[in-house]
Interface confidence: low
């Protein structure tokens, strides 16, 4: 069965659905589960063999305005002696999230949904070895 | 709320904060980026803390398919390819925003929902506890 996409009407539309102008959708930005908290291990970003730092990007015309991005600290991974091992690679792990973008055109304001790719953390991988023919 | 700069020549009636409900263009910017992590990289297999990806599907949500990572081992894979139990594979979790159909089954009415997903795994050293 086809999974319905945003804006596609694979559903039987209930009578209670709000009227929406063509080409747009109604979006309530009061977040469900707003106060949910991540319960990750402490200092995971420092204790990882592929450690990372966090930076916060801020944009007042985006909702949410703050998006946290991770950056791997090293090219290699940290070995048992605490030294960087460049035979391995620290690589970013990424996840998509949605944000609402506000656009100003003159005095009118419009809203656009946008997919944003967030770097969540890093993992240590074995490199792909390419042999020259 | 979120305060934003706006054109000083515009009428004063506009709220500086994001309104609670907005009408949004149906076309999502950057919509066609690759959402299947199995196709985008093979890190889940090559990592020293490898993970499996589980498909979570919900037609009342956009995106309807989200991939959840589950670490394969308690420990991490060492240079010999064996599990090293002195280290630990842990999930990296992230809060993401998705759209939830509200009221249910409505094609063009949504509410933002925050969900917690495990995106991948990383290998960590333990915190050492000595008994006093």
């Amino acid at each position: 069965r086809k999974i319905p996409k945003v804006g596609h009407t694979f559903f039987q539309k209930p009578e209670s659905c709000p009227p929406v102008p063509g080409g747009s959708m109604k979006l309530d930005i009061g977040i469900i589960n707003e106060n949910q908290r991540v319960s990750m291990s402490r200092n995971i970003e420092s204790r990882s063999t592929s450690p990372w730092n966090y930076t916060v990007t801020w944009d007042p015309n985006r909702y949410p305005s703050e998006v946290v991005q991770a950056q791997c600290r090293n090219l290699g991974c940290i070995n048992a002696q605490g030294k960087e091992d460049i035979s391995m690679n620290s690589v970013p792990i990424q996840q998509e999230t949605l944000v609402v973008r506000r656009k100003h055109q003159g005095c009118s304001v419009s809203f656009q949904l946008e997919k944003v790719l967030v770097t969540v953390g890093c993992t240590c991988v074995t490199p792909v070895i390419h042999h020259v023919q | 709320g979120i305060t934003i700069p706006r054109n000083p020549g515009c009428p004063n009636s506009e709220d500086k904060n994001f309104p609670r409900t907005v009408m949004v263009n149906l076309n999502i910017h950057n919509r066609n980026t690759n959402t299947n992590p199995k196709r985008s990289s093979d890190y889940y297999n090559r990592s020293t803390s490898p993970w499996n990806l589980h498909r979570n599907e919900d037609p009342e949500r956009y995106p309807s398919v989200i991939w959840e990572a589950k670490c394969r081992h308690l420990g991490c894979i060492n240079a010999d390819g064996n599990v090293d139990y002195h280290m630990n594979s842990v999930p990296i979790q992230q809060e993401i925003l998705v759209l939830r159909r509200e009221p249910p089954h409505c094609p063009n009415s949504f509410r933002l929902e925050k969900i917690l997903v495990s995106v991948g795994c990383t290998c960590v050293t333990p915190i050492v506890h000595h008994v006093a």
Partner: nanobody, 123 residues
Framework: EVQLVESGGGLVQPGGSLRLSCAAS????????MAWYRQAPGNQRELVAA???????EYADSVKGRFTISRDIPENTVYLQMNSLKPEDTAVYYC?????????????????WGQGTQVTVSS
């Protein structure tokens, strides 16, 4: 608070046996690795025997064939059966556990050490 409680140490004659036990508190809910280490006066702490969550065992060469590590999963306990004891086995024996614990609603990975139990082999 996570605790490892060792017991079973004591004074034994050469050739005798002792069984050490180490019980981990309940809030360690997944144990990756449990091990026994020992430290004789003036020496470094050394690994005696270890067992991983998949029941793989590892022994120091000096104790192979004499000592056996085993576990009781429901009781979160690891045992060290020591047979044919020699005077050079005299040391403080420490239990070590690496595992995932719950503390104040947070899960984490920790490396835990017991307070040690004295084993003396002497005639």
């Amino acid at each position: 608070e996570v605790q490892l409680v060792e017991s079973g140490g004591g004074l034994v004659q050469p050739g005798g046996s002792l069984r050490l036990s180490c019980a981990a508190s309940r809030n360690i809910n997944i144990i990756n690795y449990m091990a026994w280490y020992r430290q004789a006066p003036g020496n470094q702490r050394e690994l005696v025997a270890a067992m991983t969550s998949d029941a793989t065992t590892e022994y120091a060469d000096s104790v192979k064939g004499r000592f056996t590590i085993s576990r009781d999963i429901p009781e979160n306990t690891v045992y060290l059966q020591m047979n044919s004891l020699k005077p050079e086995d005299t040391a403080v024996y420490y239990c070590n556990a690496k595992g995932i614990w719950d503390y104040l609603g947070r899960r984490d990975f920790g490396d835990y050490w017991g307070q040690g139990t004295q084993v003396t082999v002497s005639s």
